[in-house]
Interface confidence: low
């Protein structure tokens, strides 16, 4: 299944040779990503990232998804994507609409994870998963 409606080709992984990201954060395309080793609900994950001066990851390009999939091993990680039931659509936490494919959809699964499959997976917001936080590189 096509995960994104449109694929933006031509992005390449940028490696960090300076101190652009804090320790234990991963650098990619001028952004820093933190992959937690603990779990919590989606709301707690959002607060966890906020406490680190970041947000849950907005995985809005195929390249970004591939980069994160390559480093998530096979764990499930919450990302900043939630289902707005009244609109019947998925939105990123920056309020932009996600028109791609989310698998495992269920009326009780209003949050999304990546990392255990090659797709975005709907998940219960109340089950504890790891989380991916994202912020600007310095």
């Amino acid at each position: 299944p096509q995960i994104f409606n449109k694929s933006n080709d031509g992005f390449t992984t940028t490696r960090s040779y300076g101190t652009v990201c804090p320790k234990d954060w991963e650098f990619y395309q001028a952004r820093c990503f933190f992959l937690s080793t603990s779990e919590s609900s989606w709301n707690e994950s959002r607060d966890f990232c906020k406490g680190k001066g970041s947000t849950l990851a907005i995985v809005n390009t195929p390249e970004k998804l591939k980069f994160l999939q390559d480093i998530t091993d096979a764990e499930k990680y919450f990302i900043g994507l939630i289902y707005h039931r009244e609109e019947k659509r998925w939105r990123w936490i920056n309020n932009s609409v996600f028109n791609g494919n989310v698998t495992n959809q269920n009326q009780n699964f209003n949050c999304a994870t990546i990392g255990l499959t090659k797709t975005f997976d709907a998940a219960s917001c109340d089950i504890s998963y790891r989380r991916i936080c994202e912020k600007n590189a310095k």
Partner: antibody, heavy 124, light 112 residues
Amino acid sequence: EQQLVESGGGLVKPGGSLRLSCAASGFSFSRSSYMCWVRQAPGKCLEWIGCLSVGDGHTYYASWAKGRFTISKDSAKNSVYLQMNSLRAEDTAVYFCARAPSYSGDGGHGYDLWGPGTLVTVSS
Amino acid sequence: DIQMTQSPSSLSASVGDRVTITCQASESVDRNNRLAWFQQKPGKPPKLLIYTTSTLASGVPSRFSGSGSGTDFTLTISSLQPEDVATYYCAGYRGAHTDGDAFGCGTKVEIK
């Protein structure tokens, strides 16, 4: 006391099917991240079959088990199941149910609770 | 699938000896060194000894220790005791992308 108890083993003819059950007690079944099945042929190695994420029902399997073996759950009964189809003589083994409390948390990987096992014999 | 190779397949040592068992993965286990060690006695299910390479499971004596990373791991019994007679298994975790877990074929430990 936390425990897992397997049942449903026995003698089955080649080509037959069997459904094993694993009943959990003494702990909150819904909060254990994964329930897994592992088997051991007489005098042989442990062999991983597959796991089920109790939280959302996601399953994954060893490549050799895909298609023939299916793991499912019944949260109301605090149980997980292993459906085995097209059984062969080489499937003869003790089948263990095991809990992996969290693959994703700080506890890391490790089957911390095992059932005593149930013997499956495939023979004509 | 990932494959775990243990060595030796069996060993005999004296009480008080230091015993080392190695486990080699065919490919790197995940970035959190998700490798576990189990002890199994005849007729019993395996018992978790060590998880995430070096963390001792609850109630496991401190004479057991684990180390390693990537593809090479070690279980050490610093001073072998009679109750340690058993078969020891390693298990590596790669997750759903690569067909999950795999166990080594065991190392049988006996007393001389």
